[in-house]
């Protein structure tokens, strides 16, 4: 019933008043985007806990993978299940819990010297839940299930531009951080200030590509140089 | 399991101080900005202030301005909201949420009552 | 600050029937990455508010079908296909894409 799952899918709502920027008073600024999912809840035991509804397995926790909840069901709606544990049947390594991953359809454990390189140092989430180590933080710990996949995709939450795919960089987003494409030529780009010359922007751009430098676009229109974009241009 | 548990709350008397904390698991918190939101008895909620991934940038509503601090530790997995001159009107149910997808806590409630 | 105004503020709906409520905002909530930043909660005597409804139309996992959103720009509407009994409380709506996170004034749904 509505009831039953309302009771267990807690979210709170939100409204009033805001003060300026920090170092902008009283502007208006856009906050993060984004909708109230449930997290823990007084309401809520082990028992009735909410699925997470989700996309893809990096929207999932380091223990759970993302899957229709029924057999053959509905592939539209999808929520984040319960790692399967060594000697289980998979389809993919993500539906392993961690330490093991997916050998001919079945979960066995990890060997620790398998898998090196870039999948220990990548952190990538989606918009969601997590494989990170508890200080959030990449280390060369045990290896997560969920650290056989892909790096970050555009709109995937990040922690440094390494943890994002190829032609994406990780960049502010409202109040966090999360994989941006990296610019074409002739894209607007900000001229990035140095450190110290603090300046709060809540969407930042991600920098010109590969061979490519953000420079005042050349415009004898623009009056002053203030006033000039930046594009990104050839070297 | 990804979630938010806020704790700190309690009675207190009105020009006091609390700290609330909320600790985070199963993300990646220091990617993450965070807010907290409060709910007074029989009232909407309130958003009470955000705080940057990095902690670098803090926004206050005005009801609370110069008051309250939003901090965080990433190091911890932990976000906080250290009330001073705690005001009757304060007493309310407080929660911490994450923004893009954005998760919320169970809540803890502060009693500002002489 | 974004307002949010909701229409009608209280319903009275026969069980099994649908109900419609509005909602408009002061500006457009379609941010630049393509998404609208609206939402619908309900929440009940003594509860916290329940969410229903994410980005104008995204129903939360297991939210029954008979609840839908619509809209765009600055009009949206949340619709109720057949009320049932346990529907009952205060719908609102709410915008994230400024702060501060703006909603209407709630709408109370009761049963005849």
């Known amino acids: 019933t509505l009831n039953s799952v309302l009771n267990s899918n807690a979210i709170k709502n939100l409204p009033p008043p805001l003060g300026g920027a920090a170092g902008h008073p009283g502007s208006a600024v856009s906050a993060a985007p984004g909708i109230l999912y449930p997290g823990g809840n007084k309401y809520q035991t082990i028992d009735n806990y909410q699925p997470y509804p989700c996309a893809e397995d990096e929207e999932c926790g380091t223990d759970e993978y993302c899957a229709s909840p029924t057999r053959g069901g509905d592939a539209g709606v999808q929520i984040c299940l319960a790692c399967r544990k060594r000697r289980k049947r998979c389809m993919r390594h993500a539906m392993c819990c961690p330490g093991n991953y997916c050998k001919n359809g079945i979960c066995v454990s990890s060997d620790q010297n398998h898998f090196r390189g870039e999948i220990e140092e990548t952190i990538t989430e989606s918009f969601g839940n997590d494989h990170s180590t508890l200080d959030g933080y990449s280390r060369r710990t045990t290896l997560s299930s969920k650290m056989y996949h892909t790096k970050g995709q555009e709109g995937s939450v990040c922690l440094r531009s390494s943890d994002c795919a190829s032609g994406l960089c990780c960049d502010r987003h409202f109040w966090s951080k999360i994989c941006k494409p990296v610019l074409k030529e002739g894209q607007v780009c900000t001229k990035h200030r140095r450190k110290g010359s603090h300046g709060l922007e809540i969407f930042q751009r991600c920098y010109c590509g590969e061979g490519l430098s953000c420079r005042i676009q050349k415009d004898h229109h623009q009056a002053s140089n203030s006033s000039r974009l930046h594009t990104c241009q050839r070297h | 399991q990804v979630q938010l548990v806020e704790s700190g709350g309690g009675v207190v008397q009105p020009g006091r101080s609390l700290r609330l904390s909320c600790a985070a698991s199963g993300f990646t918190f220091s990617s993450y900005g965070m807010h907290w939101v409060r709910q007074a008895p029989g009232k909407g909620l309130e958003w009470v202030a955000v705080?940057?991934?990095?902690?670098?940038?803090?926004y206050y509503a005005d009801s609370v301005k110069g008051r309250f601090t939003i901090s965080r530790d990433n190091s911890k997995n932990t976000l906080y909201l250290q009330m001073n001159s705690l005001r009757t009107e304060d007493t309310a149910e407080y929660y911490c949420?994450?923004?893009?997808?954005?998760?919320w806590g169970q809540g803890t409630l502060v009693t500002v009552s002489s | 600050d974004i307002v949010m105004t909701q229409t009608p503020l209280s319903l009275s709906v026969t069980p099994r029937q649908p109900a419609s409520i509005s909602c408009k905002s002061s500006q457009s909530l379609l941010h630049s990455d393509g998404k609208t930043y609206l939402y619908w909660y309900l929440q009940k005597p003594g509860q916290p508010p329940q969410f229903l409804i994410y980005?104008?139309?995204n129903r939360f996992s297991g939210v029954p079908d008979r609840f839908s959103g619509s809209g765009s720009g600055t009009d949206f509407t949340l619709k109720i296909s057949r009320v049932e009994a346990e529907d009952v409380g205060v719908y609102y709506c709410?915008?994230?894409?400024?702060?501060?996170?703006?909603f209407g004034q709630g709408t109370k749904v009761e049963i005849k």
């Open positions: 705080i940057s991934y990095d902690g670098g940038d803090q």
């Open positions: 709410m915008q994230s894409i400024q702060l501060p996170w703006t």
């Open positions: 980005e104008v139309s």
């Open positions: 949420a994450r923004e893009l997808r954005v998760l």
